[in-house]
């Protein structure tokens, strides 16, 4: 039940998991000039029982200077499958990861670890997105993506986060979120259907957009 792909990439945004589902693997990567110790684990694994989850194995890096190389250790081809990269950053606030059953917390850093962590996520994992510094979210709603299994294939849901640059010339300086307009049709509307046709693209999950027209006389 490993997720086949990476979580979606959103321009000018990074994602972070607040907690990791049991079965998640984290590659033991070392920074440039260091390598895994010979007997060291290839990855850490989130495991647990009904009451407690924790990371099995420990990542350990040692100087590779004696090996006459400064190249970062790269995973073998079979390890590269399902690579999920998250930058090391301060965790985001929205979820309390301490009390989520069946999940592990963010593993503590190990000495000389690489600047990016490569996770192998499992079905049901949720990641949260936020705009990088210098960008703001156009919409203040939740921005998350979940790895789901549908028709025997895994896919990540698409987070609807738009990060727009904080430019001096922006048309929306310090803009407030507008009031949500009332849903449903205005009572005054009289619907006079003029045209309705389908526009459909066949994909794995077909999406259809159809447009039609309503007219009312303007008093």
């Amino acid at each position: 039940e490993l997720c086949d792909d990476d979580p979606p990439e959103i321009p000018h945004a990074t994602f972070k998991a607040m907690a990791y589902k049991e079965g998640t693997m984290l590659n033991c990567e070392c920074k440039r000039g260091f390598r895994r110790i010979k007997s060291g684990s290839l990855y850490m694994l989130c495991t647990g029982n009904s009451s407690h989850s924790s990371w099995d194995n420990q990542c350990q890096c040692t100087s590779s200077a004696t090996r006459n190389t400064t190249k970062q250790v790269t995973p073998q081809p079979e390890e590269q499958k399902e690579r999920k990269t998250t930058e090391m950053q301060s965790p985001m606030q929205p979820v309390d990861q301490a009390s989520l059953p069946g999940h592990c917390r963010e593993p503590p850093p190990w000495e000389n670890e690489a600047t990016e962590r490569i996770y192998h996520f499992v079905v049901g994992q949720m990641v949260y997105y936020q705009c990088v510094q210098g960008y703001r979210a156009l919409h203040r709603g939740p921005a998350e993506s979940v790895c789901k299994m549908t028709h025997g294939k895994t896919r990540w849901t698409q987070p609807q986060l738009i990060c727009t640059g904080e430019m001096e010339t922006s048309q929306f300086p310090g803009e407030e979120k507008p009031q949500a307009s009332p849903e449903g049709r205005p009572e005054s509307e009289t619907s006079c259907l003029v045209t309705t046709t389908d526009f459909q693209i066949q994909t794995e999950m077909a999406a259809t957009m159809e447009t039609s027209i309503f007219t009312t006389e303007y008093q």
């Epitope: 709603g141 698409q158 727009t164 640059g165 077909a206 259809t208 957009m209």
Partner: antibody
Framework: GESLKISCKGS????????IGWVRQMPGKGLEWMGL????????RYSPSFQGQVTISADKSISTAYLQWSSLKASDTAMYYC???????????WGQGTLVTVSS | QPVLTQPPSASGTPGQRVTISCSGG????????VYWYQQLPGTAPNLLIS???QRPSGVPDRFSGSRSDTSASLAISGLRSEDEADYYC???????????FGGGTKLTVL
């Protein structure tokens, strides 16, 4: 001078969780972005060129977005497209368009 | 005036390779992905190139995109008569907080 409301119905995906954009194409001309709406909570953004000229709304219960004029002008004659905002801010699925003709 | 600049027309003979350019600025192409849309006569635009160079499924590999600094280009190799259409570049503009389009390029297959 008349009012007009055109609609865009989405299906085959979670309508309320994807932004919908509206695009104008005047006869023989190019594409112009008008605005967008997040149907989940009707959060709306307009292009400065269209702010105050049109109203964008949505009814997520029937998976439909709307573009509305309170007083049409001859210069509003154009083809209007709705499109779903997909991966990386692409407009990935487009409606077939509604031709609005304003004649005096 | 469109924010992105495209040549109004381009042409080529079947089998040829043609390139369409798209020029922008630092608040749009300089900071965001470029998308290319194909609009066949009498139809709605269709996403042709995503994220500068990615082809959505179903788009032939004859179409390719690239981006450099504040400009982008669409290349069509092995030109075919069915490629005759209008092509638009588009991107998000951080100053506008919305999409901007090129004026469109009408491609004629001679």
């Amino acid at each position: 001078g008349e009012s007009l409301k055109i609609s865009c119905k989405g299906s085959g995906y979670s309508f309320s969780t994807y932004w919908i954009g509206w695009v104008r194409q005047m006869p023989g001309k190019g594409l112009e972005w008008m605005g967008l709406i997040y149907p989940g909570d009707s959060d709306t953004r307009y292009s400065p060129s269209f702010q105050g000229q049109v109203t964008i709304s949505a009814d997520k219960s029937i998976s439909t977005a709307y573009l509305q004029w309170s007083s049409l002008k001859a210069s509003d004659t154009a083809m209007y497209y709705c499109a779903r905002v997909g991966d990386g801010y692409s407009l990935d699925y487009w409606g077939q368009g509604t031709l609005v003709t304003v004649s005096s | 005036q469109p924010v992105l600049t495209q040549p109004p027309s381009a042409s080529g003979t079947p089998g040829q390779r043609v390139t369409i350019s798209c020029s922008g600025g630092s608040s749009n192409i300089g900071r965001n992905y470029v998308y290319w849309y194909q609009q066949l006569p009498g139809t709605a635009p269709n996403l042709l190139i995503s994220r500068n160079h990615q082809r959505p499924s179903g788009v032939p590999d004859r179409f390719s995109g690239s981006r450099s600094d504040t400009s982008a280009s669409l290349a069509i190799s092995g030109l075919r008569s069915e490629d005759e259409a209008d092509y638009y570049c588009a991107t998000w503009d951080d100053a506008l907080s919305g999409w901007v389009f090129g004026g469109g390029t009408k491609l004629t297959v001679l």
